[in-house]
């Protein structure tokens, strides 16, 4: 899915209002320095691509995130604010329902959610330049200038 045409500010609002709190709940009791952040993103569409991948794609050692509250709210936000997103997810959702039987919090899942927090932080506060400024470092953001 190409996240270029999402309403980034509405997704940001959904994150700050609810999703972030669910991520904090999931990570409660974990030190912020416990995991090294190895996943990064360069602009808002790229951040959403990485967020979708980490949230919904099963990985070795962590196959259960899609059923978490933050994941369901993420899915809802993307479905509402990214045109055509929900249609692309129908097959993936059916596959997830078959794959996930129970919610298990593993250390690998905690590490993955720590990565997610970093991606969301980057998505929310990209260092966009002032209007009228021409010193963009990132061409993708040049065409999607949503102020924080």
């Amino acid at each position: 899915y190409d996240f270029t045409n999402c309403d980034f500010e509405k997704i940001k609002a959904a994150y700050l209002s609810t999703i972030s709190k669910d991520l904090i709940t999931y990570m409660s009791g974990t030190k912020s320095t416990e995991f090294n952040n190895t996943v990064s993103c360069s602009n808002r569409p790229h951040c959403l691509t990485e967020i979708q991948s980490l949230t919904f794609n099963p990985t070795a050692g962590c196959a259960s995130l899609a059923k978490e509250m933050f994941a369901m709210k993420t899915k809802a936000a993307l479905a509402i604010w990214c045109p055509g997103y929900s249609e692309t997810q129908i097959n993936a959702t059916q596959a997830m329902k078959k794959a996930r039987k129970s919610k298990v919090t593993t250390n690998k899942c905690l590490e993955q959610v720590s990565q997610l927090q970093g991606l969301w932080r980057r998505f929310n506060r990209p260092l966009l330049k002032q209007q009228g400024s021409s010193d963009y470092k990132d061409d993708d953001d040049k065409h999607h200038h949503h102020h924080h």
Epitope: K12, L16, T33, Q117, R121, F123, R125, L128, H147
Partner: antibody, heavy 120, light 111 residues
Framework: EVQLVQSGAEVKKPGSSVKVSCKAS????????MHWVKHAPGQGLEWIGA????????SYNQKFKDRATLTVDKSTSTAYMELSSLRSEDTAVYYC?????????????WGQGTTVTVSS | DIVMTQSPDSLAVSLGERATINCRAS??????????MHWYQQKPGQPPKLLIY???NLGSGVPDRFSGSGSGTDFTLTISSLQAEDVAVYYC?????????FGQGTKLEIK
């Protein structure tokens, strides 16, 4: 403990440059926007700019864009602000600050400040 | 640039009384239903400390005598019962649009 430790006070001549450092510890430096703020005597706070250590991307207040340069050294978790062509109006306390955990945009951790005095 | 104007510039309030500081933005700092306005407290020789984020949310470890309200262009910081340790300069800050801008500051003293 999450903290930012800045370099010591500097006295500089007009026309020269100063480079202030800000060493981060207790958090994953590369994933937080780092900001610089000026506080001149008897004045309010003024945002200079910000840098994302993950890729070195910067955003500047146009007022400082020509004279301020923000850089980072990820290997030492240190942010730098260099100010060139110094003049008396640059006499101030300069703070580095970390943006919050969640992308709210507030500054939740501040350095102790570095006093820069520009005098002939 | 969004200009933040605080009023009053200075304020003297008796201990235990209510203190109110206003901040007006030259244009709205709201986005998608959220107000991107923060309040800081700065004491002499110290860096600023976050008090209120996003107009009305209390910062971590901040006493509940502090509160914030407002949306759009008009915002208020209230201290319900002034304590001696609240003597400081208070700043509002908008982060909705670059460049990030602060108010000129309000100096709060004890009457």
């Amino acid at each position: 403990e999450v903290q930012l430790v800045q370099s010591g006070a500097e006295v500089k001549k007009p026309g020269s440059s100063v480079k202030v450092s800000c060493k981060a510890s207790g958090f994953t430096f590369s994933t937080y926007n780092m900001h610089w703020v000026k506080h001149a005597p008897g004045q309010g706070l003024e945002w200079i700019g910000a840098i994302y250590p993950g890729n070195g991307e910067t955003s500047y207040n146009q007022k400082f864009k020509d004279r301020a340069t923000l850089t980072v050294d990820k290997s030492t978790s240190t942010a730098y602000m260099e100010l060139s062509s110094l003049r008396s109006e640059d006499t101030a306390v300069y703070y580095c600050a970390r943006e919050d955990d969640y992308g709210e945009g507030y500054f939740d951790v501040w350095g102790q400040g570095t006093t820069v005095t520009v005098s002939s | 640039d969004i200009v933040m104007t605080q009023s009053p510039d200075s304020l003297a309030v008796s201990l235990g009384e209510r203190a109110t500081i206003n901040c007006r933005a030259s244009e709205s700092v709201d986005n998608s239903g959220l107000s991107f306005m923060h309040w800081y407290q700065q004491k002499p020789g110290q860096p600023p400390k976050l008090l209120i984020y996003r107009a009305s949310n209390l910062g971590s470890g901040v006493p509940d005598r502090f509160s914030g309200s407002g949306s759009g262009t008009d915002f208020t910081l209230t201290i319900s019962s002034l304590q001696a340790e609240d003597v400081a300069v208070y700043y509002c800050q908008q982060i909705n649009t670059d460049p990030l801008t602060f108010g000129q500051g309000t100096k709060l003293e004890i009457k």
